[in-house]
Interface confidence: low
């Protein structure tokens, strides 16, 4: 299709080499063209829409994105050629920064419903460059946290080193929706609620003698509770003894609740104690089984292929730790009475003999 009729917008992404950040292009189709697609969404301030410029998000997601090669080759379909760029409804999301993202991006409706739609397209000329090292050290992060129930602010990373007085007029979007209540380089939140979480975009215009560009930055904001003051607690195992059958496989599950921490480095291990020896066991990876705003429940299992007589003399210890402290829960195995026949016991003794040799040769013991 002929892109000469597309409206054009120039954007600059000055990315920080110190941190991961994303970038977003909106398919901001032109206002005057009141075709099926070229309508801005009219939403009340209480609503949280998914994306920017279309009337009914149920009928809408169908815009097509292309990249225009600099050598004049035909337009490339973004989805096929650029796996780090994700088309999400009416936005184009760049997952990784880099100058190789520099180029022209075109969006238009997928379904052309009328002759007017042919020219309903936007060409975005994106220039991507690393931020100069001369930039201030304290520039705002592209990931910002707001503490629920308190006051907070969201800063535009590309302007955070400038005072409010010097700052140019800023346009803010949240989850693709224009935020009209502020033009400052900082959004001040009087009381943080969960709905303040989302993807914020801040734009300002930078002009030189030749042309003007929109400088854009993307901020991922999450709303959090305060860091826990408690060490993790073990929810399972509850009992300190467990009835087992010799010669049968056994899985012991350790589940622990970790309170929220902004910097979260949970530790969950299984140890075996045997007389005065103690060693950490290689077990499957821990997995998160429930995650809420204030805590996370993590599970890690220890798997015994077959329970042996030796296992009955051992203590199995689940150890969990966060930045506050650690908690342990010990489990002693107890043979179920009248469970196994002579064959089971004979098998278990054979296994135990092999296992003794294996532990002596392979396990690193520490006291």
């Amino acid at each position: 299709f002929n892109i000469s009729g597309c409206s054009t917008k120039k954007l600059l992404w000055a990315y920080s080499t110190r941190s991961e950040e994303e970038f977003i292009l909106f398919c901001d189709l032109p206002e005057p063209q009141k075709s099926h697609f070229c309508h801005r969404s009219q939403l009340s301030p209480t609503q949280v829409p998914d994306h920017l410029p279309f009337t009914d998000s149920k009928d809408l997601p169908d815009v097509q994105w292309y990249r225009q090669p600099s050598n004049g080759d035909p337009l490339e379909d973004i989805r096929k050629s650029y796996p780090h760029i994700i088309q999400d409804k009416c936005t184009l999301r760049f997952l990784t920064p880099g100058v190789n993202n520099t180029g022209s991006y075109i969006c238009r409706p997928k379904m052309i419903k009328s002759p007017y739609d042919v020219a309903c397209c936007v060409k975005m000329i994106l220039e991507v460059k690393p931020q100069s090292n001369a930039s201030c050290e304290n520039s705002a992060s592209h990931k910002q946290d707001l503490l629920l129930g308190s006051t907070g602010s969201i800063s535009c990373p590309s302007l955070s080193c400038q005072s409010d007085a010097q700052s140019p007029e800023v346009t803010w979007y949240k989850n693709g929706k224009l935020l009209s209540m502020t033009r400052s380089n900082r959004i001040v939140v009087d009381e943080v609620y969960i709905y303040h979480q989302g993807t914020y975009v801040c734009d300002y215009t930078q002009s030189d003698t030749a042309s003007s560009w929109t400088v854009r930055a993307v901020v991922q904001v999450r709303t959090i509770v305060g860091d826990t003051k408690l060490k993790p607690d073990i929810l399972d195992p509850v009992e300190s003894t467990l009835e087992v059958e010799l010669g049968k496989p056994l899985t012991i599950s350790c589940k622990a609740r970790f309170g929220f921490e902004r910097v979260f480095n949970p530790v969950m291990k299984w140890y075996i104690k045997d007389a005065d020896l103690e060693w950490e066991v290689s077990v499957p990876e821990a997995k998160s089984i429930k995650s809420t705003l204030k805590d996370e429940i993590i599970e890690r299992n220890i798997i015994l292929e077959k329970v042996t007589q030796r296992d009955l003399r051992r203590t199995f210890v689940c150890f969990v730790q966060n930045s506050i402290g650690n908690t342990t829960q010990s489990v002693q195995l107890k043979e179920k009475r009248g469970s196994g026949g002579l064959n089971d016991i004979f098998e278990a003794q054979k296994i135990e003999w092999h296992e003794t040799v294996r532990f002596q040769s392979h396990h690193h013991h520490h006291h």
Partner: antibody
């Protein structure tokens, strides 16, 4: 296991103030939102409002002028006051806990409910 | 306020039947929808949150789907204990609102 128990008078006179308390047992009131919901006889559910452990509130606009929700963290209780009641306020009143589940984005869930208390407005 | 409309208002079904209840929102609510089950004289019980996630302990015969404005609760094989009233509820914007309910009765 967290349990909620509503308490308060079962009969309130028109134009008076309805007062209910919800006692949280088996868990802390901290880090959750605590809500009131009501259900008129034979009808559906209506959300009245919530209070957080820090005391911030949000009320249904249809009741906002008459509702006050408060919290007493030391007693593990939160309360509902509904002023100027009429027969239309006759309902079963439930208290519930709102938890926030993280799945990429946050989602509220009302996962623990009291058994409900019937309030009749009549002279 | 966002309005939720459930259909049907009531239905009769037999044990073992597959039952589908729909909930339509007056505007897009992403996936911020929960389903509850309520038995006479009891408080509602959470079944599904975020449109399709099971609350722990809820049998797998209950499933939820949908996004935007149209949502569905499906009971794959109705059991005697499933005869109750089912409500949908949106958590997208305040005030939280509920559907008017769907009563599932024994045929």
């Amino acid at each position: 296991q967290v349990q909620l128990q509503e308490s308060g008078p079962g009969l309130v006179k028109p134009s008076e103030t309805l007062s209910l308390t919800c006692t949280v047992s088996g868990g802390s009131i901290s880090n959750y939102y605590w809500t009131w919901i009501r259900q008129p006889p034979g009808k559906g559910l209506e959300w009245i409002g919530y209070i957080s452990d820090s005391g911030s509130t949000n009320y249904n606009p249809s009741l906002k002028s008459r509702v006050t929700i408060s919290v007493d963290t030391s007693k593990n209780q939160f309360s509902l006051k509904l002023s100027s009641v009429t027969a239309a306020d006759t309902a079963v009143y439930y208290c519930a806990r709102e938890t926030i589940v993280v799945r990429g984005f946050y989602f509220y869930v009302m996962d623990v409910w009291g058994q409900g208390t019937t309030v009749t407005v009549s002279s | 306020a966002i309005q939720l409309t459930q259909s049907p208002s009531s239905l009769s079904a037999s044990v073992g039947d597959r039952v589908t209840i729909t909930c339509r929102a007056s505007q897009g609510i992403s996936s911020a929808l929960a389903w509850y089950q309520q038995k006479p004289g009891k408080a509602p019980k959470l079944l599904i949150y975020d449109a399709s996630n099971w609350e722990s302990g809820v049998p797998s015969r209950f499933s939820g789907s949908g996004s935007g404005t149209d949502f569905t609760l499906t009971i794959s094989s109705l059991q005697p204990e499933d005869f109750a009233t089912y409500y949908c509820q949106q958590f997208n914007s305040y005030p939280w609102t509920f559907g008017q309910g769907t009563k599932v009765e024994i045929k």
